[in-house]
Interface confidence: low
């Protein structure tokens, strides 16, 4: 199998004319020793070819998980899930972009895109590397988290005396602590303005507003629709 034929991610599937969004299986990578991986592909947004790495839309899955769970992934691929830091690290070994899509409880949608996105390996605590921001969500609320490492409730790697993961009830690239908290607690309408540990993007609605929907998705920098 040549590298042109290989299926690495949703962009590979897109190039092979799979143009419908939904659940797909990525084959095992014998070279990297990685198993078959079930992914959800967004084949429509902004040219398609996106591999979704995180989704929050129902609140049915707790994101207050431990290091092992964030490493391997959790949730339900058609509902709320985290794809897994190990998988995200592997997918971003090729230069990738990140798109973050946000929706509030009033039905407004915004997005942020980053020209480069990568996670370090587990030895480097899945450190976050981000490129230039563009989008319509106002403040770049991931910039504060750039070049920080991942923390969970059982691994306090943040730059703070506070245990941010316990304070903000998630796993994330906590600094001291947040400008965004996309893996925070899902609060439903009516509860969504009352908490500091919700799914927040400080540049849009502020720290106390928990969003209705979030998707984080990646695709190679070199992708051409």
């Amino acid at each position: 199998q040549t590298s042109a034929d290989a299926i690495y991610d949703c962009s590979s599937l897109y190039q092979k004319n799979y143009r419908i969004s939904g659940v797909y299986k990525l084959p095992p990578d014998e070279f990297l020793g990685s198993p078959e991986l079930e992914v959800f592909c967004d084949m429509e947004t902004s040219g398609g070819g996106w591999t979704i790495i995180q989704r929050r839309k129902s609140g049915l899955v707790s994101f207050y998980q431990d290091w092992r769970q964030y490493k391997q992934g959790f949730g339900s691929i058609r509902g709320d899930f985290w794809l897994g830091n190990e998988h995200i690290h592997r997918l971003t070994r090729q230069p990738s972009r990140l798109r973050v899509e946000l929706e509030d409880w009033e039905g407004n949608a915004r997005y942020a895109e980053y020209s480069y996105f990568a996670l370090g390996n587990e030895l480097n605590s899945y450190r976050l590397f981000l490129g230039n921001y563009s989008g319509n969500v106002g403040k770049d609320a991931l910039l504060y988290h750039n070049n920080t490492v991942f923390s969970t409730k059982d691994k306090d790697n943040d730059n703070c005396l506070d245990k941010c993961a316990q304070l903000r009830k998630g796993g994330y690239w906590y600094n001291c602590c947040t400008d965004s908290n996309l893996n925070g607690v899902y609060y439903r309408l009516g509860e969504h303005r009352k908490h500091m540990d919700g799914i927040s993007w400080y540049g849009w609605h502020g720290a106390n507003y928990s969003l209705k929907r979030v998707e984080m998705k990646i695709r190679p920098e070199a992708f051409k629709p």
């Epitope: 419908i20 969004s21 939904g22 659940v23 797909y24 839309k57 129902s58 049915l60 899955v61 707790s62 949730g75 339900s76 058609r78 509902g79």
Partner: antibody, heavy 120, light 107 residues
């Protein structure tokens, strides 16, 4: 009005292949998020999930029966077909097709079921 | 595979009674659980999805609760038409699995 209807033989001989058809109306299998599944129920026993097919042709099978099952769809004709090879008397059951709609794997609308007896 | 265990397997009750059926998953499934009602010779009917969301058209005397591994279906005041068999189903991951059923009979 949404309906699903199963059809196929009521009697099958051991080792033969069973082909069941689910004909549906009131929804389309080209709509994002829609799936059709097959579930069976042996007489006096519990429900057992067999297979699922989605609008994007994603297919899921029960691992214990995967080698014997094939699910296909014809979106233009609004039908889903399940084939099950090497039938055995323990496969005697009522076979249901049902719609899976939305974000979770549950079935909101069911056909009336078709009984299948495996006997020589 | 995720195993679903329902209890009791059968239950006798009277019209007007409050009835609770439980379902336990062999591993955490968050709130990815559905409940169905099945009458003899009929197809199952969806009652509850996402553990506690009432399916459209289902009477409000039916309610669901629970998260993780332990779930309950409650019928607040039994009506004659509620005597049937009830099944839980985990919708967290494939293979989808059903409980063994709870047969609700008239006392």
């Amino acid at each position: 009005q949404i309906t699903l209807k199963e059809s196929g033989p009521t009697l099958v001989k051991p080792t033969q292949t069973l082909t069941l058809t689910c004909t549906f109306s009131g929804f389309s299998l080209s709509t994002s998020g829609v799936g059709v599944g097959w579930i069976r129920q042996p007489p006096g026993k519990a429900l057992e999930w067999l297979a699922l097919i989605y609008w994007n042709d994603d297919k899921r099978y029960s691992p214990s029966l995967k080698s014997r099952l094939t699910i296909t769809k014809d979106t233009s004709k609004n039908l889903v077909v399940l084939t099950m090879t090497n039938m055995d008397p323990v496969d005697t059951a009522t076979y249901y097709c049902a719609r899976d709609y939305g974000d979770y794997w549950f079935f909101d609308l069911w056909g009336r079921g078709t009984p299948v007896t495996v006997s020589s | 595979d995720i195993q679903m265990t329902q209890s009791p397997s059968s239950l006798s009750a009277s019209v007007g009674d409050r009835v609770t059926i439980t379902c336990r998953a062999s591993q955490g499934i968050s709130s990815y659980l559905a409940w169905y009602q099945q009458k003899p010779g009929k197809a199952p009917k969806l009652l509850i999805y996402a553990a506690s969301s009432l399916q459209s058209g289902v009477p409000s005397r039916f309610s669901g609760s629970g998260s993780g591994t332990d779930f309950t279906l409650t019928i607040s005041s039994l009506q004659p038409e509620d005597f049937a068999t009830y099944y839980c189903q985990q919708s967290f991951s494939t293979p989808l699995t059903f409980g063994g059923g709870t047969k609700l009979e008239i006392k």
